[in-house]
């Protein structure tokens, strides 16, 4: 009789282990589903926002190749300009080539004429090197033409077809840049 009870107990324990294993599998499966659901929702969200705005650039932005540009209608100091661009999902303009510089200056001539526009260029306080806001160095042909005499922080701006420098605390218009949406064809 003792042997019978012992056998039943072992069977029950085995059943319990199997149930625990099944529960564990179910929990894992549920977690996996939740994760997939999260990614699916994220994908849907991005797809919907792209479908809703199928043009490569938002309204009032100018497109050139893979970039969209926004020319501000307000003045601000360099640091505030940087923040204003981030709010719109962009950064201050980072000019990568002479072709891009020509496009920008040509567009500015058409839009506004000869004003000052902050770009994402500033001088390192210690080394005096010019750097884009992501830490990269501008190509030699894209360095500000004149060195500002300011003892304060110095930042870069575009005027007419030149790249110039000025105290970062002066007020200017600014240009933001973001990637253009790729059409999913």
């Amino acid at each position: 009789k003792l042997l019978q009870v012992s056998t039943i107990a072992m069977q029950q324990q085995e059943k319990l282990i199997q149930q625990e294993r099944a529960l564990l599998n179910f929990t894992e499966w549920k977690r996996s589903c939740a994760l997939q659901m999260k990614y699916c929702q994220a994908f849907m969200q991005n797809s919907l926002s792209s479908a809703h705005n199928s043009s490569p650039c938002p309204n009032n932005w100018i497109q050139n190749r893979e970039s969209c540009y926004y020319v501000s209608e307000i003045w601000s100091i360099w640091h505030t300009s940087q923040e204003n661009c981030l709010k719109e999902g962009s950064t201050l303009l980072q000019i990568e080539s002479k072709e891009e510089m020509d496009f920008i200056t040509g567009s500015l001539r058409k839009i506004k004429g000869s004003y000052d526009y902050w770009v994402g260029l500033s001088q390192d306080g210690h080394s005096g090197r010019w750097l884009w806001q992501d830490g990269s160095s501008p190509s030699p042909g894209l360095l500000p033409a004149e060195r500002s005499q300011s003892a304060n922080q110095v930042c870069g701006y575009v005027k007419s077809n030149s790249l110039l420098s000025s105290n970062c605390s002066t007020w200017k218009y600014f240009i933001c840049e973001k990637y253009a949406l790729r059409s999913s064809v």
Partner: nanobody, 116 residues
Framework: QVQLQESGGGLVQAGGSLRLSCVAS????????MVWYRQSPGKQRELVAG???????TYANSVRGRFTVSRDIAKSTAYLQMNTLKPEDTAVYYC??????????WGQGTQVTVSS
Amino acid sequence: QVQLQESGGGLVQAGGSLRLSCVASVNIGSLNSMVWYRQSPGKQRELVAGITGSGQITYANSVRGRFTVSRDIAKSTAYLQMNTLKPEDTAVYYCAAYDRSATAYWGQGTQVTVSS
């Protein structure tokens, strides 16, 4: 509504490193940007670094070359790796998120203290 939770602050010696994390309650790839700010007593809040939804990066002049901003979309988390810390980096560090309508959402902040 976007909820943000910062962590990783603490006390560190000058020259040391810290890594701040900011976990968001939404998919961060769908946000306009995630931005790190800091504020020290009696000073204005200042932008430290930011990363846009498409991955563009920007740094404040004072931290460029020392701090690195990054993100993990799968974990809905933005990071701020802070190296070669200086006493003047002492501040409360805040994480902010800007949604598609440029509305700002803020975390509660995490204290970073750099001793000399």
